[in-house]
């Protein structure tokens, strides 16, 4: 009869009837006394109802802690648990009393009209219809309608308990509008009250807070948090908020159902928390919990409250960013601030605007970084409220992997005359400069492009047995000069030269440059020939529309069948500067050319004349001669470059200047063009004539006027002319001071 916390020597209130269950007849008197060791009280069935007037609880005639419960003329509805408990504790003694009333075996509910049972359509859930019995051992079935169905206890999931009611899986009665319990006593049927069946949902799909994160405010601003719960149909939602400052006067909570589209299988509920003027104590975690009774889902967000608007850079803000050409560079503006600042980026003081190559926002993104992106970038943060500004400079250093200048030219596959001294060059541009440039070599025959050997795009030479130039055993005697540094096209470049003291053996030479971000290499074909010799007449690079002759000279006693060819398109795609040698082995790529044969006492000379040379005539020209005895073919290759015709241009301006009498003036006028232009000087539109005071040097590029006189004042013009036209620049020279009088009067 005792319930409570099981513990050592626990003293519970003592009941006068020492039983767990008491069965009494209707219309008799129920009296139970409860004695204890501290203040106690009684609880009885339906003790919230009006029937309470019938129940009398009195103090015993002895004892500090003793109370007697009396109910005269009990009825079936008095059936239930009678509990005597110690106040302010969970310690109690219970007796279950059955008041047997065969005319009403079911205990009526408080309303006596009908009850409501709420169920969820869940296979695993059971529902209890609270038709309690005033008799413990009744045969009870459950009737559901409409359509009418009867459920009988099966000893498993369907059962009836007089203290609890009828238990059945929810889904079995979810179709029904109402249910009731029925008991048979001596062939008589007795029904409990009707229970209306209400199918309720319980599933909460999600609970979303808006804003969901990163909520920042400053003191005095309004906080509005929306909590939206999405549920299945037939769900009621109870919202519960937890937040830091519960004693908030300006807090407002509004809950409402949101309209969903008709036919939607979902309901939406919204709870809005508003705090009109936040204080620092409102900073913290805000949690919204939505509960449907069977399910609770919650979501949280952190609200940060600042004393006042501010802006500052975060500790992770970089000052130096290193990148390699071609990479994507991201420089995030890491800041702390409220509200979020306006962000502006500058490069070397000039504002940056976003375009397809650069995005200037919270993150400065350079899509494909190039050398010209190197520099100082300033990011300025401006607080939109206080207008406070903070700036930070980030230096961007762009590294360039080694690039070898000669690789960009069409590779000279010229042959080199046996026994001559030759210089091979690699001009390297890299940032940072290469920490080393190494030279390697291998014999040409080890690397010959035999038809049986596959040549790939990435590896045009089938061999990879490169040897260090220090080991020139079996090759040409080599000397590597100390690297030189030169300013070429405005860039600091490293020039490495390899001197072949005597061209005795055909070989391949490779220069390899390495810096911290990469490597670059160039392979040079060094084909040595004892055969014919090619010369150009005139001995210079021709310009478009000029005429040029290629002479192939061979010893008549050794060679015969001199023929000129032009090297045609490659049968295989091969890297620029990586043409396989020797060309004699692959005549399919050669185009035969018309030429004129001349002879002198010892040599045959085959001349191929190009009149009005065009850019299309550029390329590699091959002279082939056959050994009279062995019939072996010997090839010599010469690369012909035709310079484009370019109209004259003058680089740099002549500037107006003021000079005092007796001083000197020195000016220069640099012109470029092809053919090279002639430079002429004019004073006041008349040709300037050299005399003792006027000196023209370096092809008239430099003009010097010594000991200027007043009459030297005027408009000076530099004019550069060629067949393609003229270019000119002008400047006015002002001569100050009085002319000294001579004593010739």
């Amino acid at each position: 009869a005792s319930v409570g916390l099981p513990s050592v020597s626990l003293d519970l209130p003592r009941l006068s009837i020492q039983k767990d269950i008491l069965t009494i007849k209707a219309n008799t008197t129920l009296q139970i006394t409860c004695r204890g060791q501290r203040d106690l009280d009684w609880l009885w069935p339906n003790n919230q109802s009006g029937s309470e007037q019938r129940v009398e609880v009195t103090e015993c005639s002895d004892g500090l802690f003793c109370k007697t419960l009396t109910i005269p003329k009990v009825i079936g509805n008095d059936t239930g648990a009678y509990k005597c408990f110690y106040r302010e504790t969970d310690l109690a003694s219970v007796i279950y009393v059955y008041v047997q009333d065969y005319r009403s075996p079911f205990i009526a509910s408080v309303s006596d009209q009908h009850g409501v049972v709420y169920i969820t359509e869940n296979k695993n859930k059971t529902v209890v219809i609270p038709c309690l019995g005033s008799i413990s051992n009744l045969n009870v079935s459950l009737c559901a309608r409409y359509p009418e169905k009867r459920f009988v206890p099966d000893g498993n999931r369907i059962s009836w308990d007089s203290k609890k009611g009828f238990t059945i899986p929810s889904y079995m009665i979810s179709y029904a509008g109402m249910v009731f319990c029925e008991a048979k006593i001596n062939d008589e049927s007795y029904q409990s009250i009707m229970y209306i069946v209400v199918v309720v949902g319980y599933r909460i799909y999600d609970v979303v807070l808006s804003p969901s994160h990163g909520i920042e405010l400053s003191v005095g601003e309004k906080l509005v948090l929306n909590c939206t719960a999405r549920t299945e149909l037939n769900v009621g939602i109870d919202f519960n908020w937890e937040y830091p400052s519960s004693k908030h006067q300006h807090k407002k909570l509004v809950n409402r159902d949101l309209k969903t589209q008709s036919g939607s299988e979902m309901k939406k509920f919204l709870s809005t928390l508003t705090i009109d003027g936040v204080t620092r104590s409102d900073q913290g975690l805000y949690t919204c919990a939505a509960s449907s009774g069977l399910m609770t889902k919650k979501n949280s967000t952190f609200v940060r409250v600042h004393e006042k608007p501010f802006v500052a850079f975060g500790s992770g803000m970089e000052s130096l960013v290193e990148a390699t050409v071609g990479e994507r560079v991201r420089i995030p503006a890491k800041y702390l601030g409220y509200p979020p600042p306006e962000i502006k980026w500058y490069k070397n003081g000039i504002p940056l605007e976003s375009n397809h190559t650069i995005k200037a926002g919270h993150v400065l993104t350079i899509m494909e970084v190039s050398e010209r992106d190197t520099g100082n970038y300033t990011v300025i943060l401006t607080n939109p409220i206080s207008k406070e500004k903070q700036s930070h400079v980030v230096s961007l250093v762009v590294y360039v992997p080694p690039q070898i200048g000669e690789k960009s030219l069409i590779s000279p596959v010229d042959s080199y005359q046996y026994g001559t001294t030759q210089t091979l060059t690699c001009t390297v541009y890299a940032i940072p400069p290469p920490h080393h440039i190494h030279w390697y070599w291998q014999l040409e025959e080890e690397c010959a492009n035999e038809p049986s050997q596959a040549v790939s795009v990435t590896n045009p030479y089938p061999c990879e047995e490169w040897r260090s130039v220090e080991d020139f055993q079996g090759g040409n005697k080599i000397e590597v000069n100390k690297n030189q540094f030169a300013l070429i096209e405005g860039k600091n470049k490293t020039v490495s030269t390899l001197v072949i003291q005597a061209a005795n053996v055909s070989a391949l030479y490779k220069c390899e440059a390495v810096n911290k971000v990469g490597r670059g290499e160039r392979v040079i074909s060094f084909h040595v020939t004892r055969g014919p010799e090619i010369t150009l007449q005139p001995d210079m690079q021709p310009t478009e529309q000029e005429s040029v002759s290629l002479w192939c000279t061979a010893d008549r006693s050794t060679f015969e069948n001199l023929t000129w060819y032009k090297l045609g398109p490659q049968p295989l795609p091969i890297h620029v500067g990586e043409l396989p040698t020797p060309v004699c082995k692959n005549l399919d790529t050669l185009w035969k050319l018309n030429a004129t044969m001349f002879s002198n006492s010892t040599n045959d000379i085959l001349i191929m004349e190009l009149k009005n040379a065009s850019l299309q005539d550029q390329g590699d020209y091959v002279c082939l001669a056959q050994d009279r005895k062995t019939k072996k073919r010997h090839c010599v290759v010469r690369q012909l470059t035709v310079l484009e015709r370019v109209a004259p241009t003058i680089t740099g301006n002549l500037e107006n200047q003021t000079t005092s009498i007796g001083e000197s003036i020195e000016v220069s006028c640099t012109a470029s063009g092809n053919p090279p232009p002639q430079i002429m000087w004019f004073k006041d539109n008349e040709t300037l004539v050299e005399d003792s005071g006027i000196v023209l040097k370096d092809g008239n590029r430099n003009l010097t006027i010594r000991r200027v006189r007043k009459e030297d004042e005027g408009l000076y013009t530099c004019q550069a002319c060629s067949v393609l036209g003229c270019a000119k620049v002008e400047a006015f020279f002002i001569i100050e001071g009085a002319q000294e009088k001579t004593n010739l009067e």
Partner: antibody, heavy 114, light 110 residues
Framework: EVQLLESGGGLVQPGGSLRLSCAAS????????LSWVRQAPGKGLEWVSA????????YYADSVKGRFTLSRDNSKNTLFLQMNSLRAEDTAVYYC???????WGQGTLVTVSS | QSVLTQPPSASGTPGQRVTISCSGS????????VNWYQQLPGTAPKLLIY???QRPSGVPDRFSGSKSGTSASLAISGLQSEDEADYYC???????????FGTGTKVTVL
Amino acid sequence: EVQLLESGGGLVQPGGSLRLSCAASGFTFSNYALSWVRQAPGKGLEWVSAISGSGRNTYYADSVKGRFTLSRDNSKNTLFLQMNSLRAEDTAVYYCAKASGDNWGQGTLVTVSS
Amino acid sequence: QSVLTQPPSASGTPGQRVTISCSGSSSNIGSNTVNWYQQLPGTAPKLLIYLNNQRPSGVPDRFSGSKSGTSASLAISGLQSEDEADYYCSAWDDSLNGYVFGTGTKVTVL
């Protein structure tokens, strides 16, 4: 918050009388049994008297039986201890408390001396 | 004259466990429940344990009570300086028809 506030203590001559009161608040007064406990200076606790919630049952220590009377006015949430024929050995701090011991007042000093 | 007997004093160093006994008879501890009280110097007693072993809310779980036959005991585990006080046991006595208190034990934290 439960509060028990004793009053009525003071100096009295041997053979004299005093009426102590205990005003209660913060709980349903008539539901609880109450008692008086005293503590002589430098001594231990001694139970004096107790009364049931309705006032129907009262109990006294042998040392005060016949001299002290305990009563309560549930309408005024007040407990009374009428002390007659006071003796020097009745000198003590008198505490009003729930009989369960859950709550105690701060006590009132009774001094019996000539 | 007290009917329940307690040792006059008990002591321990901080963190130690101290146990106080309370010895009675069949008419009090033997047939009724025991309460334990703590009295700090100059203050009213405070309930520490009721119904032999139940702790009111707010009382640290370092305090525990037990009863066996006609004796009861209070244990303080992990003794702290603020535990320095007088401790009393109490029970209803069926023969005397009233409450009886123990002689009291003074606990000192060394």
